[in-house]
């Protein structure tokens, strides 16, 4: 946020940049939270735009019985590993095909025990205020589906009739990590010393970090003909004086008429 200065008063202005503003030879360059010629005004909204998507990662282990373990499987650049990965990925894509949040799988380690597959199931959803619930539900469905497939697709008489067969008892969910996004916390942090006065309001499921000086929200302060200004003690209305009235009161709603004719004051509420 920059405000340009022209003329002789500029040198004076340079030494008067407030709130951490810096002079660049023409104007005060204001830090994020401030604006105005001298960076004297506090912004009324802060961009805390959420990420487009939120991700979750589930650490799972399954045991594949339809492939013989060889040492080559430990080498991620070997043909054995590449072929196993291709088939495992294809199988898991089928298993999780009904989950809209499912992105894919990532094998982290293969070890002996038939083939014990340590892998991550990757989930992603569009950001909405309900993203936690959406991802929690998706992780539950992942658990159900992997449990089902590893119970059904098993070797019978040493024969595997499916793309892959599993050991029913080898299925474990180790850990679930969801990307954290807390707009309230972000808003408070970015508002710094004004954090107590900034709040998050949602519009079209998008969070806005605003102070009461931002118009058009439910917390907006109505200063009538006055101007809302943020200070360390909170939002205040700065009332104006016109040719005919001066205004006062908490919200500048008390107009006092300047009477030139009678020489006394007449109040309007």
């Amino acid at each position: 946020r920059t405000t340009t200065c022209f003329g002789d008063g500029c040198q004076n202005t340079a030494s008067r940049c407030k709130n951490g503003g810096t002079w660049d030879g023409l104007k005060c360059q204001c830090p994020n939270l401030y604006y105005g010629e001298l960076c004297e005004e506090v912004v009324s909204s802060i961009d805390i735009g959420p990420p487009e998507t939120i991700s979750a990662q589930m650490e799972l282990t399954v045991t594949v019985t339809s492939v013989k373990f060889t040492e080559e499987l430990k080498n991620h650049s070997s043909q054995e590993f590449q072929e196993f990965k291709q088939t495992f990925t294809e199988q898991m894509n089928i298993v999780y095909s009904g989950i809209p949040e499912y992105v894919g799988v990532n094998i982290t380690k293969l070890r002996l025990g038939s083939v014990v597959v340590e892998h991550d199931v990757l989930l992603r959803t569009k950001y909405t205020p309900e993203y936690k619930t959406v991802l929690d539900n998706a992780t539950e469905v992942v658990k159900e589906k992997i449990t089902k497939v590893t119970t059904q697709q098993i070797m019978i008489n040493d024969i595997c009739s499916d793309m892959m067969c599993f050991n029913t008892t080898g299925t474990q969910v180790q850990n679930i990590t969801v990307t954290q996004y807390d707009p309230e916390e972000d808003c408070r942090k970015m508002a710094k010393e004004y954090g107590d006065y900034f709040v998050v309001e949602y519009r079209d499921q998008k969070p806005y970090c605003i102070s009461p000086c931002e118009p058009g929200f439910s917390v907006s302060k109505n200063c009538n003909l006055g101007k809302c200004q943020m200070s360390l003690s909170g939002p205040q209305c700065l009332c104006v004086t016109t040719e005919t009235h001066w205004y006062s009161g908490e919200t500048c709603n008390q107009g006092t008429q300047k009477s030139l004719v009678y020489g006394h004051h007449h109040h309007h509420h």
């Epitope: 013989k68 595997c160 009739s161």
Partner: nanobody, 124 residues
């Protein structure tokens, strides 16, 4: 991936014989290998399979007439077809499993790599 190319097809009279070959680009010793066929307007079906340890499996329709074999040294798979009938007319292709696949006793999902086919036409 393993590359597969079938050859040896042709036109033959009913009751005749043909030997199909399948050349593989890599090691087939640790793979299940199989032959599949697809007739016009019909689904692809498994004909014969051989596991890495040499155990063979056949579709009921070809049992006793077809023999599957492999030569690991030559990375080749074969299908000897005797007593051919018009219903054997189809495009024949070979297929391979991933390395170290076990439990191949079906003619279905385990063969994930598929090659170019060769046409077999049996006339009465």
């Amino acid at each position: 991936d393993v590359q597969l190319q079938a050859s040896g097809g042709g036109a033959v009279q009913a009751g005749g014989s043909l030997r199909l070959s399948c050349a593989a680009s890599g090691d087939i010793t640790r793979r299940c290998m199989g032959w599949f066929r697809q007739a016009p307007g019909k689904e692809r079906e498994g004909v014969a399979g051989i596991s890495e340890d040499g155990i063979t499996i056949y579709a009921d329709s070809v049992k006793g007439r077809f023999t599957i074999s492999k030569d690991n040294a030559k990375n080749s798979l074969y299908l000897q077809m005797n007593s051919l009938a018009p219903e054997d007319t189809a495009n024949y292709s070979c297929a391979a499993s991933i390395l170290n696949r076990v439990g191949c006793r079906q003619l279905s999902y385990e063969y994930i790599y598929r090659g170019q086919g060769t046409q077999v036409t049996v006339s009465s």
